[in-house]
């Protein structure tokens, strides 16, 4: 037999079917020009010493073979003895290691068998009523196809599915969508209405994420507030990576899960923008404010479940960074300015009340005054911090107030509102004899003592009503008792107590009269 012809003789090897799973497969035969044909196949297993024979049985029942040697592709003409206008059955027999392995058969009419391409280029993936919809442009001059898909997950083998007949410039397929695992899809096509025509090769992998992106399992920690009034948010645990099927490992466009960080600054509600969304890889610096942080996972099908954490406010207070002067027109606060053209947010809230009751005011961008201070003033009529109670004040600063991650904490401190000098006056002053020339003076704690750092000291004043001599005794803010000594029996005295802040002298309590009785000896 000539090599260009299909040889109508018994094949030149014995009948020794191996029945093994390896061997030739995926035989494809098609017309490649007006009079030429090509068959190609794949061989699975060791290729050393393998000889391939393309077998063909005609509709008459006569059978022949082409010897392909070690090649897995063979071309022949319409003069090779194979009828191209009638149906034939073709298969490959591979002779290796004294046994024969056979491919599945293809039965077709060669003249009408066109080489079909798999979907090429961009395969668009979308979700439609809980299913996956794939769409692609029909390859040129190949309208009219039967389409199959195969899909697998990281833990399951390939499963075959049918897309049905296609007859348009665009083709599509509805496929199952997995809820929680990624899938790899491949598509193949063959000529529609040509019984037994060869399938195209499988397309490149289409990697599809699960319908639900994995919930982010991450943990955060927040550093101490630095000198610049900012603290870094750090990721303690990276989100777990999605397990991918074999063909999607490495470069797997489509299965990406993006994790975004949504910051919500709870403090200073009067600022322009309260939330900001960032990429998880870019961990921000935060002010000392309270925040809610959410990690949102999303894939090409949209967002999934998110995980939310609360980052409490940094409650470290500055001792005396804030000066407050109360005048007839109102109150002015002074603090060390941060830089030129800074916007400040002053937030205050009655101590011991829910964070939702915080009030705040935003200043216009301001430069430092000649003393390097920034200021904020308000009138009595505004009612700001007007009640005689303790307020917690935080001042935030930003050169770009519209950018949530550029706020910093200037200071946090306590302030007693209203008429602090009067409200802070100690009550229930009492005098008890202590010895022959001394007394013990006690009083109830000033309201100012409820406000950390506000009460600087108590002053106890003792006046000798005879000589009009006055002595003043400073007392630590934590004490509510003092012993006055060097007193004379029979002399009338008055005692008063006041509570002072760093910037305000208190109002004296009501005078309390007392005297030490003269001791009469027997």
């Amino acid at each position: 037999c000539r090599t260009s012809e299909c040889c109508f003789q018994d094949p030149p090897y014995p009948d020794a079917d191996s029945g093994s799973a390896s061997g030739p497969r995926d035989l494809r035969c098609y017309r490649i020009s007006s009079d030429r044909y090509e068959c190609s196949w794949q061989y699975e297993g060791p290729t050393a010493g393998v000889s391939h024979f393309l077998r063909c049985c005609l509709s008459s029942g006569r059978c022949c073979y082409f010897a392909a040697g070690s090649a897995t592709r063979l071309q022949f003409s319409d003069q090779a003895g194979v009828s191209v206008l009638y149906t034939v059955t073709l298969w490959v027999e591979s002779w290796a290691r004294n046994q024969t392995e056979k491919s599945p058969e293809v039965t077709l009419q060669l003249y009408n068998s066109v080489k079909y391409e798999p979907p090429l280029g961009d395969i668009k993936v979308s979700k439609l009523a809980g299913q996956l919809r794939m769409e692609w442009e029909t390859p040129d001059n190949q309208v009219g196809a039967e389409v199959q898909f195969r899909h697998r997950t990281p833990s399951s083998p390939w499963k075959l599915g049918d897309c049905g007949p296609q007859d348009d410039d665009t083709e599509s397929c509805l496929c199952p969508l997995e809820m929680n695992v990624a899938q790899e899809f491949q598509l193949r096509r063959r000529q529609l209405g040509s019984q037994g025509s060869s399938w195209s090769k499988w397309s490149s992998p289409v990697c599809v994420p699960p319908e639900n992106p994995p919930q982010p399992q991450v943990r955060f920690s927040v550093e101490q507030l630095g000198q610049d009034g900012r603290r870094r948010l750090t990721l303690k645990e990276q989100p777990t990576q999605l397990e991918l099927p074999e063909g999607c490992q490495g470069l797997a466009p489509g299965t990406e899960v993006t994790y975004r960080l949504q910051l919500h600054m709870l403090s200073c509600p009067c600022k322009a923008k309260a939330t900001r969304t960032l990429h998880l890889g870019k961990m921000p610096y935060l002010s000392g404010a309270a925040y809610n942080v959410a990690v949102i996972s999303s894939n090409q099908f949209g967002p999934g479940l998110n995980q939310t954490w609360h980052i409490p406010a940094d409650t470290h207070t500055e001792p005396v960074a804030l000066n407050i002067s109360v005048g007839t027109n109102g109150t002015t606060m002074y603090w060390p300015a941060r830089a030129q053209s800074m916007t400040y947010c002053i937030e205050w809230q009655p101590v011991g009340q829910d964070g939702g009751l915080a009030t705040c005011s935003l200043t216009a961008p301001q430069d430092p005054d000649p003393a390097g201070m920034a200021t904020y003033s308000w009138s009595r009529e505004s009612g700001a911090m007007g009640q005689e109670k303790c307020y917690y004040i935080t001042i935030f600063a930003s050169a770009h107030p519209e950018k949530l991650t550029l706020w910093s904490t200037v200071l946090s401190t306590y302030h007693f509102g209203g008429n602090a000098s009067a409200a802070g006056t100690p009550h229930h002053v009492s005098v008890k004899n202590h010895s022959l020339d001394s007394v013990s003076v006690d009083w109830a704690p000033s309201l100012l003592s409820t406000c950390p750092g506000v009460l600087k000291e108590y002053v106890v004043r003792c006046r000798d009503e005879d000589s009009k001599q006055v002595s003043e005794h400073p007392v630590q803010p934590t004490e509510t008792q003092v012993t006055l000594s060097g007193l004379r029996a029979g002399v009338a005295y008055t005692v008063q107590v006041r509570a002072d802040t760093a910037w305000l002298r208190g109002v004296w309590s009501q005078p309390q009269r007392f005297s030490i009785e003269v001791q009469v000896s027997d």
């Epitope: 109508f8 094949p11 009948d15 079917d17 029942g61 059978c63 059955t89 024969t100 058969e105 039965t107």
Partner: nanobody, 125 residues
Framework: QVQLVESGGGLVQAGGSLRLSCAAS????????MGWFRQAPGQEREFVAA????????YYADSVKGRFTISRDNAKNTVYLQMNTLKPDDTAVYYC??????????????????WGQGTQVTVEP
């Protein structure tokens, strides 16, 4: 090799129908071309019909074309021969055969290496 067991033969009036079955056991059924042959008393064994492994391509002897239909169910490891409009000339022992490799012709009995015991079909005039 495969073991083949035929069934479904019997006595039938001319013009009647029978359906023969051939159950295969052993090696992978789908890797065999399957055929039916028959042998009338005092005659040579003759080819009746064959079917390729994929079940698409079928072949028939001219004498049975249009009356007999061969089919296979690879899931059930069974090949069938539906015989309609039977004639007295169809009387014979019908054999099921399996070819793991076909030679130069599907109808060539030497290609078939496994054979059943046969089932008798008798067609009365």
């Amino acid at each position: 090799q495969v073991q083949l067991v035929e069934s479904g033969g019997g006595l039938v009036q001319a013009g009647g129908s029978l359906r023969l079955s051939c159950a295969a056991s052993g090696r992978t059924f789908s890797s065999y071309v399957m055929g039916w042959f028959r042998q009338a008393p005092g005659q040579e064994r003759e080819f009746v019909a064959a079917i390729m492994r994929n079940g698409i391509m079928t072949y028939y002897a001219d004498s049975v074309k249009g009356r007999f239909t061969i089919s296979r169910d690879n899931a059930k490891n069974t090949v069938y021969l539906q015989m309609n409009t039977l004639k007295p000339d169809d009387t014979a022992v019908y054999y099921c055969a399996a070819a793991s490799r076909v030679g130069v012709s599907i109808s060539q009995s030497s290609s078939y290496t496994s054979w059943g015991q046969g089932t008798q079909v008798t067609v009365e005039p």
